[in-house]
Interface confidence: low
């Protein structure tokens, strides 16, 4: 199908014209402009950047660009009462203190308003006690400690290394284990790539570098004080005691120089195995407490951060559709950063800016997309996806009726090895077809397609000759659109060759060293990877907004549903006796998946044959495609997670960054052998199979012939 047919525009205004207008040099220039000072959410600097982007998007040619503001709960350190951790002797004297700030990178020594490292939303407190090293503080790490090693974290301060899972899950796990404080640190094993120098001489984390980040467990709620509703001028706010997702114990992050000083004295139990050892010159003893000579010394945390309701600003730009203005394709990424945001988010924001400029250029030449494109610069993503979630809460009725797709645009790069895509199965074919048309930027793949280099470097584990595409999890602004509203979503960026370290981020993530120079010197000097990501993100938006028939293939959903059903069944079959005792059957789910597969196949045949010149039938077929993702939404949500409503996908309960399939069944089965009431536990498994089977069957029926 030709994208041109949509609005009877001249042939030069096709996808190629849009892609050819994207320029690496512009992305580079925009990145420089966005990274010269910090743009922390809730600050004047970030408000000024919002107004600058609003003005520039108007100049680029969008029909309208508005600021949407909300008053949400944010968290900041106390400038006169800094946070730190100390080792104290038996007299209470502080014999070692962690650093109060990161040494600024060259050229940035005189920049003001660099927020010192802190864990956003940590409560205030000054707990002191023995230290317990808990590895990554994952669910399985606490199982190992408590069940196998019989180590009790109750009343202890735990120290955990960053990586593998979202930091909020670490804090939640520590709270559940009874800890009274959490110290998070970056171990060189996870944040120092062998053979690469530390910043400013390379892209590795120096010993004084620290990862900032929020430690909430919002489960999709948005602003902690106004869950489910926008934090507008007349909002009713919960008291802080009823706020959603706030941690109850003090938390603070440190770098590996400081971590060395705490960990080198650790005594108690030896690490259970080599997977608990990082790369510091310490024994990685678990504790509790310090060894021999140091056994009377304790660790004390000094946390004085405050939570404040603060105004944030989204920028929302509109390019009205010529044929279906009431159908929205959204491209959104955040603008707020922890410090300079060299990668996160401005490498993404610069790409969005260039995509807007290219679309604006086409519009000035008389072109319009078939459907409306909305562009968003979200605020306060770093504080819990707040800007995007509040806007979606405010506009939920419009979005659930009109939302075709959401494409996320945070960091464009986390490496420079190959493409990484996470998306709904509906977009698999779109991504495959698009990347076959784009040139690979990779060395050794000159003249080859992006699809070819991507497939070679990141092959699908299931299908030979195809690239890996991952499930959507969370930890970014697509969450509300996909997990709550059921709008087909996707994200793309360039990544590293580091599959085992998937959720640890790049070494300088959320540190002061995430600068323009980091990108320009070490990651992408020619900005060719940024350009490729702009082509992928922009190309997806162009096709979604302009193709006559929506570029969704429902058959790909059928394939993954079967795979996910097989996977969850095999997990359950680890308990054959209980399945027999409690009459647990997956027949209903497999039957629903079979029906979905057959109906999707028939729908796809009709899609090939129908009369595309009939606007009513065209709209009807497109609506069936648009609403398919919506059909997987359960209005009641998942157990204890009402804002995660997608039955097929949810963020893992053990790692917000990761996606889990059939999450309701998965969570019901998780650790089921330890449940005190097995009859009740297996009853919940059966209920979740019922919900999943019903949802898949109901979704299938939305694809049936309407009459």
């Amino acid at each position: 199908k030709s994208s041109n047919e949509a609005t009877n525009i001249t042939p030069k205004h096709n996808m190629k014209a849009f892609l050819d207008e994207l320029k690496a040099e512009n992305i580079k220039k925009f990145l420089y402009n966005f990274t010269q000072i910090p743009h922390l959410a809730g600050t004047e600097q970030n408000f000024q950047l919002a107004k600058q982007i609003q003005s520039q998007w108007k100049e680029f040619g969008l029909d309208s660009v508005e600021l949407a503001h909300y008053d949400v709960l944010l968290s900041y350190p106390n400038k006169t009462h800094p946070n730190y951790i100390s080792i104290i002797n038996e007299d209470g004297n502080e014999i070692f203190n962690t650093s109060l700030f990161e040494p600024p990178p060259p050229g940035y020594e005189n920049v003001s308003d660099i927020v010192p490292p802190f864990s956003a939303f940590s409560p205030q407190g000054m707990p002191e006690g023995d230290l317990v090293y808990v590895n990554y503080a994952r669910t399985e790490d606490f199982f190992k400690l408590e069940r196998d090693m019989k180590i009790n974290c109750s009343g202890k301060i735990v120290i955990a290394r960053y990586g593998k899972v979202f930091r909020g899950n670490k804090v939640k796990n520590a709270q559940l284990a009874g800890a009274k404080g959490v110290i998070l640190y970056s171990d060189p094993a996870d944040y120092f790539a062998p053979g690469v120098k530390s910043y400013p001489d390379g892209w590795n984390l120096p010993g004084g570098g620290v990862q900032r980040g929020n430690i909430l467990n919002l489960n999709g709620a948005g602003d902690p004080l106004t869950p489910g509703y926008p934090a507008n001028e007349y909002a009713y706010r919960r008291g802080i005691a009823e706020a959603v997702g706030l941690p109850s114990i003090p938390v603070h992050p440190i770098g590996y120089y400081d971590a060395q000083k705490l960990l080198e004295k650790m005594g108690g139990s030896a690490p259970p195995d080599s997977s608990w050892r990082g790369s510091l010159k310490v024994p990685y003893n678990v504790g509790p407490g310090f060894t021999g000579n140091f056994s009377t010394q304790k660790v004390k945390m000094h946390i004085h951060s405050t939570n404040e309701v603060t105004r944030i600003y989204n920028v929302i730009g509109t390019l009205r559709g010529a044929v279906e203005p009431d159908r929205y394709v959204i491209l959104g990424g955040h603008r707020d950063s922890w410090v300079f945001g060299g990668i996160d988010p401005q490498s993404g924001a610069a790409v969005v800016h260039e995509i807007v400029r290219s679309f604006g250029t086409l519009k000035k030449e008389g072109w319009r997309p078939r459907r409306t494109i909305l562009f968003a610069s979200w605020d306060a993503e770093e504080f819990g996806l707040l800007g995007s979630t509040e806007w979606a809460e405010e506009n939920s009725r419009l979005l659930q009726e009109r939302g075709v797709a959401y494409i996320n645009a945070d960091s464009s790069i986390e490496g420079n090895y190959t493409l990484r895509v996470d998306c709904t199965p509906l977009m698999y074919s779109l991504v495959h077809n698009l990347t076959k048309e784009l040139k690979s930027p990779d060395e050794g793949f000159e003249g080859k397609s992006l699809y070819e280099s991507w497939t070679k470097k990141s092959p699908s584990p299931e299908f030979s000759g195809m690239p890996r595409i991952s499930k959507l999890g969370s930890g970014n602004d697509f969450e509300v659109f996909f997990q709550r509203l059921g709008i087909a979503s996707g994200r793309a960026r360039y990544t590293k060759n580091w599959e085992t370290n998937k959720f640890s981020g790049y070494p300088l993530y959320h540190s002061v060293y995430e600068t323009y120079e980091l990108v320009e010197k070490f990651y992408d000097p020619m900005f060719k990877y940024h350009l490729t990501v702009a082509q992928v993100r922009g190309g997806m938006v162009f096709e979604l907004a302009n193709s006559i028939v929506l570029p969704f293939d429902c058959r790909d959903y059928a394939v993954v549903l079967r795979k996910y059903a097989d996977k969850i069944y095999s997990i359950s079959m680890k308990h054959p006796q209980e399945m027999k005792t409690y009459s647990v059957s997956f027949d209903s789910l497999f039957s629903a998946v079979k029906n979905f597969t057959e109906i999707a196949s028939k729908f796809s045949e009709r899609l090939q044959d129908f009369d595309k010149s009939n606007p009513i039938v065209l709209r009807m077929m497109n609506d069936q495609l648009m609403f398919l993702e919506r059909a997987f939404i359960d209005p009641l949500g998942l157990p204890d997670r009402p804002f995660y409503r997608h039955v097929i996908y949810a963020p893992s309960s053990h790692n917000k960054y990761a996606g889990e399939s059939f999450p309701g069944i998965y969570d019901a089965l998780f650790d089921i052998e330890s449940k005190v009431d097995p009859s009740k536990a297996w009853g919940e498994v059966k209920r979740q199979i019922y919900v999943a089977a019903f949802t898949v069957q109901a979704a299938a029926e939305t694809l049936s012939e309407v009459a």
Partner: antibody, heavy 122, light 107 residues
Framework: EVQLVQSGAEVKKPGSSVKVSCKAS????????ISWVRQAPGQGLEWMGG????NYAQKFQGRVTITADESTSTAYMELSSLRSEDTAVYYC???????????????????WGQGTLVTVSS | DIQMTQSPSSLSASVGDRVTITCRAS??????LNWYQQKPGKAPKLLIY???SLQSGVPSRFSGSGSGTDFTLTISSLQPEDFATYYC?????????FGQGTKVEIK
């Protein structure tokens, strides 16, 4: 796969110097941490020194110099004021791990050259 | 400088035997201890790094344990190709140092 290929055997007079080369292939040379280890006939292994960070065993201090030419991916070990007890096989080795600029984190000598026999005899 | 002491200096064993070699450091080296195997006329080969991690391609009958100052290399069931000299080496602090070696001979 990384390979280290050393220069050929040498016969030297006491008091002279010897310079052994070690060419690396199959990876980024700048990320290698090259060390030199020697083994006298019938004796054990003796670490002489290494780069990244540069450090020499006390026993060889002032007599050994370890250098590298990144453009040719070649490391060199020069030992001066040779004596008969310097007769040994000299190995060029890669240490796995890295140097952070603060600590070194090395986990073993995982790639070895084939060895160069240096004989010191009058 | 850190001294490494291996024991025994030699041992005789038969195929199928369980063999244990110990290595002691003069001060704590955490887990920065590596084990090598050397056969006559050949370069040494890394077996175990970081006290207990098996180098890729090394048979699972080799295992290492210990941390701090005392370390052990164990061959669970000696095979004909395992008769060789074994060295420990510390990579905690430069200058690095080797143990004097343990020769495993056929009984």
């Amino acid at each position: 796969e990384v390979q280290l290929v050393q220069s050929g055997a040498e016969v030297k007079k006491p008091g002279s110097s010897v310079k052994v080369s070690c060419k690396a292939s199959g990876g980024t040379f700048s990320s290698y941490a090259i060390s030199w280890v020697r083994q006298a006939p019938g004796q054990g292994l003796e670490w002489m020194g290494g780069m990244t960070p540069k450090n020499y065993a006390q026993k060889f201090q002032g007599r050994v110099t370890i250098t590298a030419d990144e453009s040719t991916s070649t490391a060199y070990m020069e030992l001066s004021s040779l004596r008969s007890e310097d007769t040994a096989v000299y190995y060029c080795v890669r240490a796995s791990g890295y140097y952070s600029g603060y600590h070194s984190y090395y986990y073993g000598l995982d790639v070895w050259g084939q060895g160069t026999l240096v004989t010191v005899s009058s | 400088d850190i001294q490494m002491t291996q024991s025994p200096s030699s041992l005789s064993a038969s195929v199928g035997d369980r063999v244990t070699i110990t290595c002691r450091a003069s001060q704590s080296i955490s887990y920065f201890l590596n084990w090598y195997q050397q056969k006559p006329g050949k370069a040494p080969k890394l077996l175990i790094y970081a006290a207990s991690s098996l180098q890729s391609g090394v048979p699972s009958r080799f295992s290492g344990s210990g941390s701090g100052t005392d370390f052990t290399l164990t061959i669970s069931s000696l095979q004909p190709e395992d008769f060789a000299t074994y060295y420990c080496q510390q990579s905690h602090t430069m200058p690095w140092s080797f143990g004097q070696g343990t020769k495993v001979e056929i009984k």
